[in-house]
């Protein structure tokens, strides 16, 4: 069977496969997808590896029509380096020469520079080009190699392996070498894999069953990090409680050297943020940290400096810390909108059982706000969801230049963010360079501020306008009509009417079900409009959701089924890829992200159209 | 490097007690299994009794019932206590365990042996 990392290489002209007969002749041979020696893999950015032989696809000089054949991998060789060009060419690096399928007389695999059919080939059974299953870098934990990537094929008591391998060891321990030989260069480390035993590698908080892993040994990147973590179904380690704090400045007592956390205001227009989405509700800053150099835009654990946090340049080398299992955040169970019939006052806006309200002219204290929004049934705006503050941006009449208290505070506990009516933290979204925080300004309070209603913390005696919130009435006489300039069974989001397509349908069914229905495939404008969609369909319980967008007219470039212009993205992780296809909104914990799928998976849709009545706005000059 | 060290091996008449103890110190991250095999005068080295770091144990079937395998995780160290002793027991005991170690991706280490007689 084939590894998900293993492919044959499938040239549709002649309909047949590339097969490394012997490491000398790489040829053709009509496709078995069981037959070793039409498997392939990439081991590097730019290597090709037979798994028959663990060696790899290379020329002995980069010239016009020399023979490809299989040589010991070696990474710094130039003669081993491929990449894939326009569309489905494969080319040595760098030169305009090709994988080319040879000819009548040349029965092996050669290096030509001409580009017509026979140069062109793409994964068996797909239509992806070879670099759609490119190589993933494998980071290693403890070991000798400070956590470097492994090295596949590396050689072992002179067996080449290119794989994890438990060899050596007798209690089945996944390792691999970080060079090609380890024989010589003796540099190893242990793979971030499922095996008995590796959940040792954790260290598990049992007042709340997380899970940590500190590899103080590595030395990465950031991004290598996260990375790592990832590889193993985890996150770079965020903090929002301070038991859990405690707990880390306990498991890291020993340690001197800093570690990479998930702490990182890599987002252009936002401000501090964690990795794994946690809110940034609690702050445990090194004194003169956060600097606002730029540039320092991830942030490292200090254990030597009772394990508080300092802000540096994301391309430092460090160690690390992950973490997996219940997230810290308590559970707390947020209504979808349409859960919830919502009956508000006059002058009150209903949004998810709630009612809300923007006091902009009186301007007051965040205390006497608080009091007022009190005095009225409610509180100062707790926000909990995206979709809660598109709703409150988007329909709540909120202006660009306004600066609004909400709830939330940190006057109870210093550097420890509550909301003011007592829901648990469970959002975020701080404008860039906040929460500031500055020690010499007792910045206690939130606001709401800026085009996009991104929070900064505030001195709570600046007086201001206010958003209130309160539970809605189970029933009352003033039911907004919401669905107004919509057909039955469409939901009405600004100027337009959506609708949940229930049949399982291809891409081009579904097009064609909402073009009968006088709409279109959904297109997907700003980060809105996508949050709206999120809740919509987010949790439900089908696994995606067609939008209009697809590559398939331009392969590599994204179009919207009526040709509107694509002015914003929501891809999900390693997407779009380099894979073509048409795309689809994921439900579930990836609520919304955009998968890329194959057209003719059958999936439900999302059809929308300018509501009734509504008048179209100009269309943006360019 | 990593080192195992036995110790409590001995003389005992049939029937007797003896308890073998084994401390791993060194460049240890952890040990997955720990365990105890014997080799008597021309004859191949055997197990005797292993136990996970999880504590599952599995024994020879000649030694089941008389012998116990214990460790305390936290000092590295097994033990073996050997009750209803035989003359077919007398052999060099040796200690075995599977560490990961920070230098090598070899596993398995083994002690000297200590020396364990059943006679009277």
């Known amino acids: 069977l084939l590894d998900t990392r293993q492919f044959l290489i499938y040239n549709e002209d002649h309909k047949r496969c590339v097969d490394a007969v012997s490491p000398s002749a790489v040829q053709t041979a009509a496709c078995n997808q069981d037959a070793e020696s039409q498997k392939f893999r990439w081991v590097s950015e730019s290597q090709i590896m037979s798994v028959a032989f663990k060696l790899c696809l290379g020329v002995p000089s980069k010239t016009d029509w020399v023979a490809i054949t299989l040589y010991a991998c070696d990474s710094k060789s130039e003669f081993q380096k491929w990449e894939c060009k326009n569309d489905t060419l494969l080319g040595i690096k760098g030169e305009d020469l090709f994988f080319n399928y040879g000819n009548r007389q040349e029965k092996n695999i050669m290096l030509y520079k001409g580009s017509g059919l026979w140069s062109r080939w793409k994964i068996y059974g797909t239509t992806d080009n070879l670099c759609s299953r490119g190589y993933e870098a494998m980071y290693t934990l403890l070991g000798n190699a400070n956590g470097a990537t492994c090295a596949f094929p590396f050689k072992f008591e002179n067996k080449w392996y290119a794989d994890c391998t438990s060899a050596g060891r007798s209690d089945g321990w996944l390792w691999c070498g970080t060079t090609t030989d380890y024989d010589t260069d003796k540099l190893f480390g242990y793979c971030p894999l499922k095996f008995e035993g590796s959940e040792s590698l954790w260290n598990k908080d049992p007042l709340t069953s997380v899970s940590y892993q500190i590899n103080s040994k590595s030395a990465l990147t950031w991004h290598q990090a996260r990375k790592s973590c990832q590889q193993q179904n985890a996150e770079l380690l965020s903090i929002t409680e301070i038991h859990e704090q405690t707990y880390l400045t306990g498991l890291t007592s020993s340690l001197t050297s800093g570690l990479w956390i998930g702490l990182n205001s890599l987002s252009f227009n936002s401000g501090w943020q964690w990795s794994d989405r946690s809110p940034f509700r609690y702050l445990n800053w090194l004194p003169g940290s956060p600097s606002a150099e730029p540039g320092k835009s991830c942030v490292s654990l200090n254990p030597g400096k009772n394990a508080k946090w300092e802000n540096l340049e994301c391309v430092q080398k460090l160690g690390y810390i992950c973490k997996k299992g219940n997230t810290t955040l308590n559970s707390f169970v947020i209504p979808s909108e349409s859960d919830v019939p919502t009956h508000c006052p006059s002058q009150w806006w209903p949004y998810a059982g709630h009612c809300y309200k923007i006091h902009r002219d009186e301007k007051k204290i965040q205390r006497d706000a608080l009091t007022t929004c009190r005095k009225e049934g409610g509180d100062l705006t707790s926000i909990h969801t995206i979709e809660e503050l598109d709703f409150i941006i988007s329909q709540l009449g909120y202006e660009p230049n306004d600066e609004l208290w909400i709830g939330l505070n940190d006057i109870k506990i210093q550097m420890y963010f509550e909301w003011s009516d007592g829901t648990p933290v469970t959002f975020t979204k701080w404008l860039r360079g906040e929460p500031s925080h500055e020690n010499n300004r007792q910045e206690d309070c939130v606001v709401m501020k800026g085009k996009d209603g991104y929070w900064a913390d505030r001195g709570c005696e600046w007086p201001l306008g206010y958003i209130c919130k309160m539970k809605s009435r189970s029933q009352g006489p003033e039911i907004v009509e919401v669905e107004k300039g919509c057909r039955k069974g469409w939901k009405k989001h600004h100027f337009y009417c959506y609708m949940i397509g229930h049949t399982l349908s291809t891409f081009a069914e579904a097009n064609q079900t909402c073009n009968n229905e006088n709409a279109y495939l959904t297109t997907i404008e700003d980060r809105y409009e996508q949050a709206f969609l999120t809740s919509f369909v987010g949790l439900r319980p089908e696994k995606y959701f067609w939008t209009g967008l697809s590559d398939i007219q331009t392969k590599g470039t994204f179009q919207w089924t009526i040709e509107e212009e694509v002015r914003f993205t929501h891809w999900n992780s390693d997407m779009p890829g380099r894979k073509p296809g048409c795309v689809a909104m994921r439900t579930g914990i990836a609520g919304g992200l955009w998968d890329v799928l194959k057209c003719d998976e059958k999936a439900k849709f999302v059809c929308k159209h300018w509501a009734e009545g509504v008048t179209h706005p100009p269309k943006p000059t360019t | 490097q990593v080192q195992l060290q036995e110790s409590g091996g001995g003389l005992v008449q049939p029937g007797g007690s003896l308890m073998l103890s084994c401390a791993a110190s060194?460049?240890?991250?952890?040990?997955?299994?720990m365990g105890w095999y014997r080799q008597a005068p021309g004859k191949q080295r055997e197990l005797v009794a292993a136990?996970?770091?999880?504590?599952?144990?599995n024994y020879a079937d000649s030694v089941k019932g008389r012998f116990t395998i214990s460790r305390d995780n936290a000092k590295n160290t097994v033990y073996l206590q050997m009750n209803s002793l035989k003359p077919e027991d007398t052999a060099v005991y040796y200690c075995?365990?599977?560490?990961?170690?920070?230098?090598?991706?070899?596993?398995?280490?083994w002690g000297q042996g200590t020396q364990v007689t059943v006679s009277s």
């Open positions: 136990i996970t770091s999880g504590g599952n144990t």
């Open positions: 075995n365990a599977a560490i990961v170690t920070m230098t090598s991706p070899y596993s398995d280490y």
């Open positions: 060194g460049n240890i991250f952890t040990i997955n299994r």
